[in-house]
Amino acid sequence: IVNGSDCQKDAQPWQGALLLGPNKLYCGAVLISPQWLLTAAHCRKPVFRIRLGHHSMSPVYESGQQMFQGIKSIPHPGYSHPGHSNDLMLIKMNRKIRDSHSVKPVEIACDCATEGTRCMVSGWGTTSSSHNNFPKVLQCLNITVLSEERCKNSYPGQIDKTMFCAGDEEGRDSCQGDSGGPVVCNGKLQGLVSWGDFPCAQRNRPGVYTNLCEFVKWIKDTMNSN
């Protein structure tokens, strides 16, 4: 997150981190039920760990943290790397969470977001596009949903109904390491961090997010059948 601010501890209890090795964060994720996460399909890796209930970027133990393995990764069938359409994936964890003030699921929005809606995006991704700077703790950023027209003007030929754009003035954006993390609007999960221009946080090049209202049925059906 570029030019966000430290999230309040436990204010984003659905925020997850996908880790490689002992503690290398490569993507965010969102807890949507006691045993299921959503993330971006492009975050798929054969082996990874899941961390919930953690505030700090560092691996220091926190009392609220819970660690999991992913036992099933189910990318949306319409996703095709390296395209950006249908960029979502369900992850089934090896066990259910212990519900606590630090770890709670978020409800997915059934209605699509409208232009001007204020939302919050969060993550432990880079705080500048030099790709070296990481935050000490989870970052939060208020962003505004942009019109479809403005979104398509920003990225001609690259936007479809499985995406929406959101941003703020130049210098505020999600960035590398935030993928798969939550965009929460009015208390409901509206999107996942997906893509945007490189470097992050450029004028007229907003963040692009997976439009979850288009996938509510697929998410429910997939969880029920697995």
């Epitope: 490569y26 492009h42 975050c43 890796k45 999600s174 993928s179």
Partner: antibody, heavy 126, light 107 residues
Framework: EVQLVESGGGLVQPGGSLRLSCAAS????????MNWVRQAPGKGLEWVSY????????DYADSVKGRFTISRDNAKNSLYLQMNSLRAEDTAVYYC???????????????????WGQGTTVTVSS | DIQMTQSPSSVSASVGDRVTITCRAS??????LAWYQQKPGKAPKLLIY???SLQSGVPSRFSGSGSGTDFTLTISSLQPEDFATYYC?????????FGGGTKVEIK
């Protein structure tokens, strides 16, 4: 078959210009960032330039900045390198290479260059 | 710019030998290192990405390890087709930089 084929190399005098081309086939070219990498005779690999999938981000090695220009035409599945003010030290085999890292995606994960052309030779000599 | 230093610059080995090549970055690059193999007159070939992940089609005798600034490429049992020059490359930060190369020669 995924393939990159370079062309446009040749002998040029110092101060002269050349335009290299790289024709891509067998994959969706518009989805991938691309690079030019060169190798002087008997030397190691040197990265020259990078262009993102949509051409929105471009970068160059200091040794070629202001003299070389990278571009692409996604409709033609082609990558280009315009080389001006050529010097003797630009003599090398020039490779185009596909970058597996999608820098538009906002994951923190980096790969490398997975597909390379056969190279085209540029000789700068009087 | 990040400097990549490879050692040794050349190594003589026999078929069946275990060969280890090291690469050091001038600043931390986490696990974001690639290894390439290049044979004379040919283009480089990606062997390993993300320090330890084997590229599709690459034999399992090749392995990579390391994180931060120090990395290693190991060929567990050298085969005749492995005699080549090997390069490391840091991939997260522009400008991309390569190591100077390690030539693996027949003893």
């Amino acid at each position: 078959e995924v393939q990159l084929v370079e062309s446009g190399g040749g002998l040029v005098q110092p101060g002269g210009s050349l335009r290299l081309s790289c024709a891509a086939s067998g994959f969706t070219f518009e989805h991938y960032s691309m690079n030019w990498v060169r190798q002087a005779p008997g030397k190691g690999l040197e990265w020259v330039s990078y262009i993102s999938s949509s051409s929105s981000y471009i970068d160059y090695a200091d040794s070629v900045k202001g003299r070389f220009t990278i571009s692409r035409d996604n409709a033609k599945n082609s990558l280009y390198l315009q080389m001006n003010s050529l010097r003797a030290e630009d003599t090398a085999v020039y490779y185009c290479a596909r970058d597996l890292t999608d820098r538009q995606s906002r994951d923190y994960y980096y790969y490398g260059m997975d597909v390379w052309g056969q190279g085209t030779t540029v000789t700068v000599s009087s | 710019d990040i400097q990549m230093t490879q050692s040794p610059s050349s190594v003589s080995a026999s078929v069946g030998d275990r060969v280890t090549i090291t690469c050091r970055a001038s600043q931390g690059i986490s696990s974001w290192l690639a290894w390439y193999q290049q044979k004379p007159g040919k283009a480089p070939k990606l062997l390993i990405y993300a320090a330890s992940s084997l590229q599709s089609g690459v034999p399992s005798r090749f392995s990579g390890s390391g994180s931060g600034t120090d990395f290693t490429l190991t060929i567990s049992s050298l085969q005749p087709e492995d005699f080549a020059t090997y390069y490391c490359q840091q991939v997260p930060i522009f400008p991309y930089t390569f190591g100077g190369g390690t030539k693996v020669e027949i003893k």
